[in-house]
Interface confidence: medium
């Protein structure tokens, strides 16, 4: 039975050019984490393996930074970077768990950031 | 110590079918990519596949795509490499090597020679 | 399919830096990787992830990637180090090639 929930930093936006970290947090399971990947619709950006720790798309391999912890650090961001973007916690023995965190990048200088936790 | 063994020198006749193996010991063998390398003699390096044992994930190079098969039995933490109809042009030097995610082959087998002549 | 292009020979003096360039289109999106092969061996990874360098590999060897070429320096370069060079790239599919590899000579 899967009992774990992912917390996630939700509806984000930040200003073009920038950078924005991407969190998730699995609670509520004592499941072993084995990898956790990061993607933007059906597109691979990063894997964070247990064993084998970080390894980065290397179609991201220059916007993209590993951590802070499983998060995700996006660089150097554009307008195409908005969209969905979901993490995927692969456990033992429960299985999957998946969040979703909308990006918005915008033109404007002025960028609200979403709650941070 | 990390350690891939490949089975032993073949020589095979033209349409004979040969199946040339690769055992991993030393690391966790469903963590890691397998693949295959082929060098004709006196030739480069030819990315042919490769399998993640974990869940026998497997990709072909174009060129190699209907012309072998790659498997892996994870239970015996063994990859392969077979051929159904050999030919000639297949003489060559075989060698696995394994990877892990986007990093480069960082461990190789001492290859396997296979000698098609009739 | 997507094709990486080698110099066949470079030649360098004991001491003198080596550089091995390998081409492709955008290169520089893809993961380059180096092998070193003597005759005889099975090959050796020297770079991985365009800069990296796995343990046991001296300093000497560097690399990087961007545009469309990636580079292998070899700074002080050795007898030892006369060898057949291959740079390797990976896409996000896994799908891997190698460059057609270059015969390095050190003179002397």
């Known amino acids: 039975m899967m009992t774990g929930t992912i917390e996630t930093t939700g509806n984000i936006s930040a200003e073009k050019g920038g950078s924005i970290i991407l969190q998730c947090h699995l609670s509520s399971t004592t499941a072993q984490v084995t990898q956790v990947n990061w993607e933007q619709q059906d597109q691979l950006l990063a894997i964070c393996n247990a064993d084998l720790g970080w390894h980065i798309s290397p179609s991201f391999k220059d916007r993209v930074a590993p951590g802070p912890g499983l998060g995700l650090t996006l660089q150097s961001l554009t307008v195409n970077d908005t969209g969905e973007y979901f993490c995927i916690y692969h456990t033992y023995p429960d299985g999957t768990y998946t969040g979703r965190i909308f990006l918005e990048v915008l033109e404007s200088s002025v960028a609200e950031h979403g709650a941070r936790f | 110590e990390v350690q891939l063994v490949q089975s032993g020198a073949e020589v095979k006749k033209p349409g004979e079918s040969l199946k040339i193996s690769c055992k991993g010991s030393?690391?966790?063998?469903?963590?890691?990519?397998i693949g295959w390398v082929r060098q004709m003699p006196g030739k480069g390096l030819e990315w042919m596949g490769i399998?993640?044992?974990?869940?026998?994930?497997?990709r072909y190079s174009p060129s190699f795509q209907g012309q072998v098969t790659i498997s892996a039995d994870k239970s015996i933490s063994t990859a392969y490499l077979q051929w159904s109809s050999l030919k000639a042009s297949d003489t060559a030097m075989y060698y696995c090597?394994?990877?892990?995610?986007?990093?480069?082959?960082?461990?190789w087998g001492q290859g396997t020679l296979v000698t098609v002549s009739s | 399919s997507y094709e990486l292009t080698q110099p066949p020979s470079v030649s360098v003096a004991p001491g003198q830096t080596a550089r091995i360039t390998c081409s492709g289109d955008?290169?520089?999106?893809?993961?380059a990787s180096w092998y070193q092969q003597k005759p005889g061996q099975a090959p050796v990874l020297v770079i991985y992830?365009?800069?990296k360098r796995p343990s046991g590999i001296p300093e000497r060897f560097s690399g990087s990637n961007s545009g469309n070429t990636a580079t292998l320096t070899i700074s002080g370069t050795q007898a030892e180090d006369e060898a057949d060079y291959y740079c390797?790239?990976?896409?996000?599919?896994?799908?891997?090639?190698f460059g057609g590899g270059t015969k390095l000579t050190v003179l002397g």
């Open positions: 390797s790239a990976k896409d996000a599919s896994f799908n891997s090639v």
């Open positions: 955008a290169l520089g999106d893809k993961y």
């Open positions: 399998i993640y044992p974990g869940d026998s994930d497997t």
């Open positions: 030393g690391y966790s063998f469903t963590s890691y990519w």
């Open positions: 992830e365009d800069s």
């Open positions: 090597a394994r990877a892990a995610w986007w990093q480069g082959f960082d461990h």
